[in-house]
Interface confidence: low
Amino acid sequence: ALEVQVPEDPVVALVGTDATLRCSFSPEPDFSLAQLNLIWQLTDTKQLVHSFSEGRDQGSAYANRTALFPDLLAQGNASLRLQRVRVADEGSFTCFVSIRDFGSAAVSLQVAAPYSKPSMTLEPNKDLRPGDMVTITCSSYRGYPEAEVFWQDGQGAPLTGNVTTSQMANEQGLFDVRSVLRVVLGANGTYSCLVRNPVLQQDAHGSVTITGQPMTFPPEA
């Protein structure tokens, strides 16, 4: 069979950017593009994404957001450019190459989007005294994939007690995360929320510092 090569690791692409799904083959010395049949398709549904046959680019069948690298095809570069990446693009794409023989390989696209700096709210937010039970809410928006949320005190020690975290996908598939910490106030202290994107290994931090009265929130970065 024809050897078709793709990267082993998933291609990570930020939402809204362009991604290149690399695929290559080794053409014979006498190879001409007229002999080439190239098909990119979604691995799971077999939906056609892009194709090249009969010596010419047959175009995108995938929302007109794909392109080949025509000047590089003759050298065995069958890579696909996917423009304006969306969450819904995540998954496995298969590159089929047929000349005399044929071969195929699948490449995974992992989509990612950074989470916004968390906004922090505190309830109740006045007349607080040590020993009071308060609810601190950390909200971060439009990230992907689902976040990991961690709470810490001012010394960096984890706060794992009464935490409720919910994540909701919007119409674009991006997640809004809301994490609620219920905690008994100490004499003073800082409560930090860390929202981690597991793919980008990106951390977004928010914190609220309680120093008696009044409550102070750090300025937004």
Epitope: D89, E90, G91, A106, E171
Partner: antibody, heavy 120, light 107 residues
Framework: QVQLQQSGAELARPGASVKLSCKAS????????MQWVKQRPGQGLEWIGT????????RYTQKFKGKATLTADKSSSTAYMQLSSLASEDSAVYYC?????????????WGAGTTVTVSS | DIQMTQTTSSLSASLGDRVTISCRAS??????LNWYQQKPDGTVKLLIY???RLHSGVPSRFSGSGSGTDYSLTIDNLEQEDIATYFC?????????FGGGTKLEIK
Amino acid sequence: QVQLQQSGAELARPGASVKLSCKASGYTFTSYWMQWVKQRPGQGLEWIGTIYPGDGDTRYTQKFKGKATLTADKSSSTAYMQLSSLASEDSAVYYCARRGIPRLWYFDVWGAGTTVTVSS
Amino acid sequence: DIQMTQTTSSLSASLGDRVTISCRASQDISNYLNWYQQKPDGTVKLLIYYTSRLHSGVPSRFSGSGSGTDYSLTIDNLEQEDIATYFCQQGNTLPPTFGGGTKLEIK
């Protein structure tokens, strides 16, 4: 909170049809593919097919083409599966399940299952 | 269709043990491997998706690993509430297919 509520147990005669329902709440019903999965007593799980309620697009595994028909009602956020020409091998628990992130075929929320018993 | 094989159909372990459940695919599934827990009452829950990503709300004692055709689910410090049947499922190619399940029991 995201929930899938399935209809109650069904007892049916061989050759008859049944229509199972799965009511979704807590999320945008039209944005997620809904799956149906079969489990025979003491057996593993078997994927039947999926429907995208936003436009009614469906996919079936070969074995269940002609046996199962998937539909969805956007107004009531309810997915349905009709099983026709019932036979004893259709006796099973049927689950509906929401597919998670687009393009990743995992099922993040499951209904409690509906038991279908086919008996004469 | 891709065949998923869980060679161990039942497994006995003691509370506090570390338990590993294996799953093999009939071909490379590019890490598109998910794990589910089915309790004796029939309730099914997603534990891990894409080989190692812990689903929201799942205790951190559950972890997943693997690549190519061989994957595993590990439960550290086994608890009574972990008594269930565990299924693997590939999501690389339609139709999605499940392993036969591994029933976990207490010694």
